[in-house]
Interface confidence: medium
C-alpha cells in the first residue's frame, strides 16, 4: 500500500531512508535538458522474494536536444557541484548499508539524473531526519517518521526534532538543558 502523502517537512532538516521497503517506487527523473530513454520504464521498483530484494529496471536519461545537433550538453559548474554531492552521498550510503530482509538498499545512481530523487513510499517505511549544515538538532524523541495505516488511511508519524541555528535559543519551551545529539546519517537531499 503506497503512502498517500510525503513524509512531514521539518524546517532546516532533510530526511532519507536507510533502506527501502519492497513496493517502493523511485521516479526515473532526469535533469534539465535530458529525458528518459524511450524504451525506459518511468520508475524503478523495489521487488524481491523472502530472502533478497533489489531494484527492478534501471533508469537512463538521454539528451532531449535534437538528434542531428552537434552541440554537446556539458554540465554547468553548478550542476557538476550538485552531482559531486550526490556522488559523495552515494559513497557514504553504500559504505554502511545493511541488508534488511524485504528491503532494497539505496538505488544505484544514473547518468544525468535529477538533483532530487522522488520516492513513492509504502506503509511501514521509516525515514530518518537530520538538520542541514549550520543547524543543530534538538530532540524530544526519535528523529524519524514512519508511514502507518490507521482506519484505512495512511499517515506519517511526526518526528520529534527541531533544528536550531547556533545563535537561536536552544531550548524547547518549558525545558531546561536539552542534549544536542550527534547526527549519524550521511547528509542527503530531501527524498519525497
Amino acid at each position: 500500500e503506497l503512502c498517500d502523502d510525503d513524509p512531514p517537512k521539518i524546517t532546516h532538516a532533510t530526511f532519507k531512508a536507510v533502506a527501502y521497503k519492497e513496493g517502493t517506487m523511485l521516479n526515473c527523473e532526469c535533469k534539465r535538458g535530458f529525458r528518459r530513454i524511450k524504451s525506459g520504464s518511468p520508475y524503478m521498483l523495489c521487488t524481491g522474494n523472502s530472502s533478497h530484494s533489489s531494484w527492478d529496471n534501471q533508469c537512463q536519461c538521454t539528451s532531449s536536444a535534437a538528434r542531428n545537433t552537434t552541440k554537446q550538453v556539458t554540465p554547468q559548474p553548478e550542476e557538476q557541484k550538485e552531482r559531486k554531492t550526490t556522488e559523495m552521498q552515494s559513497q557514504m550510503q553504500l559504505a554502511d548499508q545493511v541488508s534488511l530482509p524485504g528491503h532494497c538498499r539505496e538505488p544505484p545512481p544514473w547518468e544525468n539524473e535529477a538533483t532530487e530523487r522522488i520516492y513513492h513510499f509504502v506503509v511501514g517505511q521509516t525515514v530518518y531526519y537530520q538538520c542541514v549544515q549550520g543547524y543543530r538538532a534538538l530532540h524530544r524523541g526519535p528523529a524519524e517518521s514512519v508511514c502507518k495505516m490507521t482506519h484505512g488511511k495512511t499517515r506519517w508519524t511526526q518526528p520529534q526534532l527541531i533544528c536550531t541555528g547556533e545563535t537561536e535559543p536552544s531550548q524547547f519551551p518549558g525545558e531546561e538543558e536539552p542534549q544536542a545529539s550527534p547526527d549519524g546519517l550521511p547528509e542527503s537531499e530531501t527524498s519525497r
Partner: antibody, heavy 122, light 104 residues
Framework: QVRLQQSGPELVKPGASVQMSCKAS????????INWVKQRPGQGLEWIAW????????YFNENFKDKATLSVDKFSSTAFMLLSSLTSEDSAVYFC???????????????WGTGTTVTVSS | QIVLSQSPAILSASPGEKVTMTCRAS?????IHWYQQKPGSSPKPWIY???NLASGVPGRFSGSGSGTSYSLTVSRVEAEDAATYYC???????FGGGTELELK
C-alpha cells in the same frame, strides 16, 4: 578467490537454441548482478543484459530482448543464458561478468567469466 | 543512447614510449571505465570511474577526462601492455570499439 567459470564451446545449427552457464564461486552469488556480454570474432564488446540472482530481476539491452533469456540457480550459484532462433550473427564469444555499484556508486564489471564460444553453422 | 568512439583503432609504440588513447562520448557523461583484453582471454578491469586503477594495474597507467572526452595514458610502455583497451559507460554499459596497443 572470486571466479566465474563458463560452460564449454557450442556448435549449433541456424534456427536452434543454445543455453550456456556461468558458475560463480568465492563470493555470495545472490548479492551481485551478473551481466552477459557478446564479442563477435575480431570485434568489440556488446552488453546484453543483467540479472540479479537474489530475486531474478532482469534488465536488457533493447537489441537482445527477443534473443536472450536469463535465469539463475541459486543452489548451485549458476547463471544461465538461453539464446534462441540462432543465426550466423549470433556466432560469438559470450562472457558473463559480475557487476557491483560499490565503486563510488558507479556500476563496474569487476570479475569476468572465462567465455563461451558459440558457433552457428549448418 | 550514448555512443563511445575510441581512437586510434591501432596504436603502435616502442617500449619506454608514452602513449595516450582516447574515448569520446556522443553526449556528456560523468565517468567511464577501461578494460584490458588480450587475445584469447577475457577482459580485465583496468581503470574504473575515469581515473582509479583496478587492483594489480601498474602505476604507469593513468586515466583522465570529463564531459565527452576521456583518455587512458601509459607513461612508459612495456611489452606486457600489448592488448586491446575498451572504454565503457558506467550507466548504459555501452562499450567503445577498442584501441589495440601493439609494440614495435
Amino acid at each position: 578467490q572470486v571466479r566465474l567459470q563458463q560452460s564449454g564451446p557450442e556448435l549449433v545449427k541456424p534456427g536452434a537454441s543454445v543455453q550456456m552457464s556461468c558458475k560463480a564461486s568465492g563470493y555470495t552469488f545472490t548479492d551481485y548482478y551478473i551481466n552477459w556480454v557478446k564479442q563477435r570474432p575480431g570485434q568489440g564488446l556488446e552488453w546484453i543484459a543483467w540479472i540479479f540472482p537474489g530475486n531474478g530481476n532482469t534488465y536488457f539491452n533493447e537489441n537482445f530482448k527477443d534473443k536472450a533469456t536469463l535465469s539463475v540457480d541459486k543452489f548451485s550459484s549458476t547463471a544461465f543464458m538461453l539464446l534462441s532462433s540462432l543465426t550466423s550473427e549470433d556466432s560469438a564469444v559470450y562472457f558473463c561478468a559480475r557487476a557491483t555499484y560499490d565503486h563510488g556508486g558507479y556500476w563496474y564489471f569487476d570479475v569476468w567469466g572465462t567465455g563461451t564460444t558459440v558457433t552457428v553453422s549448418s | 543512447q550514448i555512443v563511445l568512439s575510441q581512437s586510434p583503432a591501432i596504436l603502435s609504440a616502442s617500449p619506454g614510449e608514452k602513449v595516450t588513447m582516447t574515448c569520446r562520448a556522443s553526449s556528456s557523461v560523468s565517468h567511464i571505465h577501461w578494460y584490458q583484453q588480450k587475445p584469447g582471454s577475457s577482459p580485465k578491469p583496468w581503470i574504473y570511474a575515469t581515473s582509479n586503477l583496478a587492483s594489480g594495474v601498474p602505476g604507469r597507467f593513468s586515466g583522465s577526462g570529463s564531459g565527452t572526452s576521456y583518455s587512458l595514458t601509459v607513461s612508459r610502455v612495456e611489452a606486457e601492455d600489448a592488448a586491446t583497451y575498451y572504454c565503457q559507460h558506467w550507466n548504459s554499459f555501452t562499450f567503445g570499439g577498442g584501441t589495440e596497443l601493439e609494440l614495435k
